[in-house]
């Protein structure tokens, strides 16, 4: 059988020689040389030789327990003749026995850590861990004790856990805000002799809410002219808070002050100044300074802090309104007006008044802006505003008038202002009615007495209140003797009627009409308008089939049935 | 470069002996036992036996025990082996081999020995 | 004296086909994992050469062609794609016990 026990060997041997290991040995080898002894396995034939006749063992290298701490190798004897082996290959172990030759590393060069400001004494910040690759199951090589070297009275750290803490009391970020600390790891449980290493922790304090906001001034003063429309920003202020991010984050509001209904003051969320603003229209004449009471204060407040003092600031904003240089203004905004289209050039329409608003009352002229009455139809008076007329009117031709009237200081003409005029052209009975179209008809010569032959229409320009009331009726001239008649059917239309039974196309081919067609308006309006009545032979069902003259060339859908 | 090289063929009379060298080189002779293995012609391998050239420790077949010798001359890393009273049944290739844990890993090149009256 | 058999006597086989040579011992010849078999090629006119030793490991410089297999009284060794080079006479040798014996041999040739 195998004789040996588990071998052990000193890892980092500095000798010149190779490191004897041990022996292996069967009971078998009768020591004449015929046994040979192979070695197999972790670095056989490499780290580890044998002695293939006495089975010792050597190590060719420096071994390190930390790259690799146990080897796990194969035995044989063999009989060198017959290649029998004489034993069962066996496994065997290599321990490599623990120095202390590593120092403890931190698993971090640099750590950073973070730790709000004015925090408890003992407030957990960062754990720094160092770990040793020396054998931590025998002697201290690997028991690692922490001290701080640099960042006291500020901070300490336990020695058994790495864990950093605050050691001071309101330590305040805006005094100082960044701490470098170094922490030292040493083996051997902190003992003489043992190895360290160290780590740089770098600590910032964060913020939070112990400062309010300051205005750096009591009092601000803006000026603004009265002109400024609402929105208009007119000045900016700004409370410093000696915090930052949220905790610095300013709100402003107006809490007081005759200018509280006039005036807003809103967050610019960038630079963090309130800026005031106008809220309504400002008119210097009525009110030329206003006094606000505008406070700053923090959103979000933290109530341990409450002790130090309401967390809001206020500051007096005077704000002087300038006078500007006003344009006339004038009593409407629009004038409507109204005019018969009979009126005499020169009559008088209506007039419009304008007022400089300033407290010097400039006197204002009045003008009729041309491009807006290129035909000079109207003029104004340049003194008092009278609109006239300067030429006749038509309301046919153009019902409504938009002119712009321009009211300007005599004393700065530059300040002027417009104003429309919207003059409505009243109708008069100026227009006769007529034939709403050219009328030209046939009778057939068979046709009966009192046959409709056409149905007449009329139009009128005017545009009377109570509508059209027209009357139709043979010219005087016609009346007597006429072969036909014109019935008046009181709805704006008439029909001609034949007046004998049949006619000659032969004896008169062609019939004229004269029709008075008058309105019923002041003054009475008629006209005398002709329709043509041409004699045709016809079928018997009416149907026109020649005319003396050229065939008729009949509207559409005209009836001309007995 | 591991060599074995053998002494040349024989021609012999029946019942007299005959003695092969082999003469080894490219390696520690007396680290290895030598062999010497016969093949009658047209017929397969026969193990004669082995020395152990540090010890002259010596093996050898029952068939040959009393008509075969093995010696080694360390001086001159050489083998020897010696077969007397020698019949026709003899005529045969004589090698000489290296022997390692039991295996056969370089052979000498042969010799031939005749036996004829 | 252990007595090794092979078969067959003879092999045709074709080129880059599998050739397979059996060797039984009339015993075991194994012993602690360890198997004293032992393969030889001979070419006409030439020594014999080692191929596999302790039945399953390539001497340097065999071609991974040839393998070993087996364990106590039956071995075997393979070619698995034939060359034209390897045809020879196949043997087998225990080394487990005096008188170390060899198997009759087989003839590998091309079909």
């Known amino acids: 059988s195998w004789m040996w026990n588990q071998f052990f060997l000193l890892e980092e041997y500095t000798g010149s020689d190779y490191q004897y290991v041990g022996k292996l040995h069967s009971d078998q080898d009768r020591g004449d040389g015929s046994l040979k002894y192979i070695l197999s396995g972790d670095g056989a034939g490499d780290l580890f030789i044998i002695n293939e006749n006495t089975g010792d063992i050597q190590a060719t290298k420096r071994l390190d327990r930390e790259e690799k701490p146990v080897y796990i190798l194969r035995a044989q004897a063999i009989n060198r003749r017959t290649g029998r082996p004489v034993e069962p290959e066996s496994e065997f172990i290599i321990k490599i026995h623990d120095i202390n030759d590593n120092e403890p590393i931190f698993t971090k060069e640099v750590y950073t850590a973070t730790v709000p400001e004015m925090s408890d004494v003992g407030t957990f910040v960062v754990q720094v861990t160092a770990t040793d690759a020396d054998d931590p199951t025998y002697g201290n090589s690997a028991k690692v004790v922490y001290s701080i070297l640099q960042g006291q009275p500020y901070f300490s750290v336990e020695s058994e856990t790495g864990i950093i803490k605050t050691a001071l009391l309101n330590m305040d970020r805006e005094n100082r805000e960044q701490y470098q600390v170094v922490i030292q790891a040493k083996d051997m449980g902190g003992q003489m002799g043992g190895l360290s290493g160290t780590t740089t922790v770098n600590i910032t304090l964060t913020d939070v809410n112990d400062n309010p906001p300051r205005f750096p001034q009591s009092t601000y003063q803006f000026k603004t002219p009265e002109s400024s429309p609402p929105g208009t920003p007119i000045g900016r202020i700004k409370a410093s808070d000696a915090d930052v991010g949220e905790n610095a984050e300013i709100e402003y509001s107006i809490t007081d002050g005759e200018g509280l209904d006039m005036f807003d003051v809103i967050t610019d969320q960038e630079t963090q100044e309130g800026i005031i603003t106008v809220k309504k229209l400002l008119d210097f004449e009525k009110k030329k300074v206003y006094t606000l009471k505008v406070e700053a204060s923090n959103p979000y407040v933290e109530p341990r802090f409450l002790y130090l003092g309401p967390f809001k600031d206020s500051a007096t904003v005077r704000i002087v309104v300038e006078d500007v240089d006003e344009p006339p203004v004038f009593s409407k905004l629009a004038y409507i007006l109204q005019i018969r289209e009979d009126a005499q050039i020169n009559t008088t329409i209506g007039s419009v008044t304008a007022q400089d608003p300033d407290a010097a009352r400039n006197p204002v002229k009045y003008s009729v802006d041309r491009h807006t009455d290129m035909d000079r139809i109207f003029n104004i008076d340049s003194g008092n505003g009278s609109i006239f007329t300067s030429k006749l009117l038509d309301r046919e031709t153009l019902l409504w008038h938009n002119i712009t009237v321009i009211a300007t200081e005599i004393n700065n003409p530059k300040q002027s202002s417009r104003v429309p005029l919207y003059i409505k052209v009243l109708d008069v009975n100026d227009n006769a009615p007529e034939f709403a179209e050219f009328y030209e008809t046939f009778v057939c010569e068979k046709a009966k007495a009192d046959q409709l032959i056409q149905t007449l229409h009329a139009v009128d320009k005017d545009d009377p209140y109570s509508g059209h009331q027209f009357s139709f009726s043979l010219a005087p001239e016609a009346a007597s003797g006429s072969n036909f008649t014109i019935q008046d059917n009181k709805d704006n239309t008439a029909g001609i009627l034949t007046r004998k039974n049949g006619y000659n196309r032969h004896e008169m081919s062609t019939y004229l009409l004269p029709v008075v067609i008058s309105d019923n308006d002041y003054p009475v309006q008629s006209s005398t308008g002709t329709v043509t009545v041409r004699v045709c032979a016809c079928d018997h069902h009416g149907n026109m089939q020649s005319c003396h003259a050229e065939a008729l060339i009949h509207p559409t859908g005209l009836s001309t049935g007995a | 470069e591991v060599q074995l090289v053998q002494s040349g063929a024989e021609v012999k009379k029946p019942g007299s002996s005959v003695k092969v060298s082999c003469k080894a080189s490219g390696y520690t002779f007396t680290n290895y036992w030598m062999h010497w293995v016969r093949q009658r012609p047209g017929q397969g391998l026969e193990w004669m036996g082995d020395i152990d050239p540090s010890h002259s420790e010596t093996h050898y077949t029952q068939k040959f025990k009393d008509r075969v010798t093995i010696t080694v001359d360390k001086s001159t890393s050489t083998a020897y082996m010696e077969l007397s009273s020698l019949r026709s049944e003899d005529t045969a290739v004589y090698y000489c081999a290296r022997g390692d844990l039991g295996r056969f890993d370089y052979w000498g090149q042969g010799t031939t020995v005749t036996v004829s009256s | 004296d252990i007595v090794m058999t092979q078969s067959p006597d003879s092999l045709a086989v074709s080129l880059g086909e599998r050739a397979t040579i059996n060797c039984r011992a009339s015993?075991?010849?194994?012993?602690?994992?360890?198997?004293?078999m032992h393969w030889y090629q001979q070419k006409s006119g030439q020594p014999p050469k080692l191929l596999i030793y302790a039945a399953s490991n390539l001497e340097s410089g065999v071609p991974d062609r040839f393998s070993g297999s087996g364990s106590e009284t039956d071995f075997t060794l393979t070619i698995s794609s034939l060359q034209a080079e390897d045809v020879a006479v196949y043997y087998c040798?225990?080394?487990?016990?005096?008188?170390?014996?060899f198997g009759g041999g087989t003839k590998v040739e091309i079909k």
């Open positions: 015993e075991s010849v194994s012993i602690h994992g360890t198997h004293l």
């Open positions: 040798q225990q080394s487990f016990e005096d008188p170390w014996t």
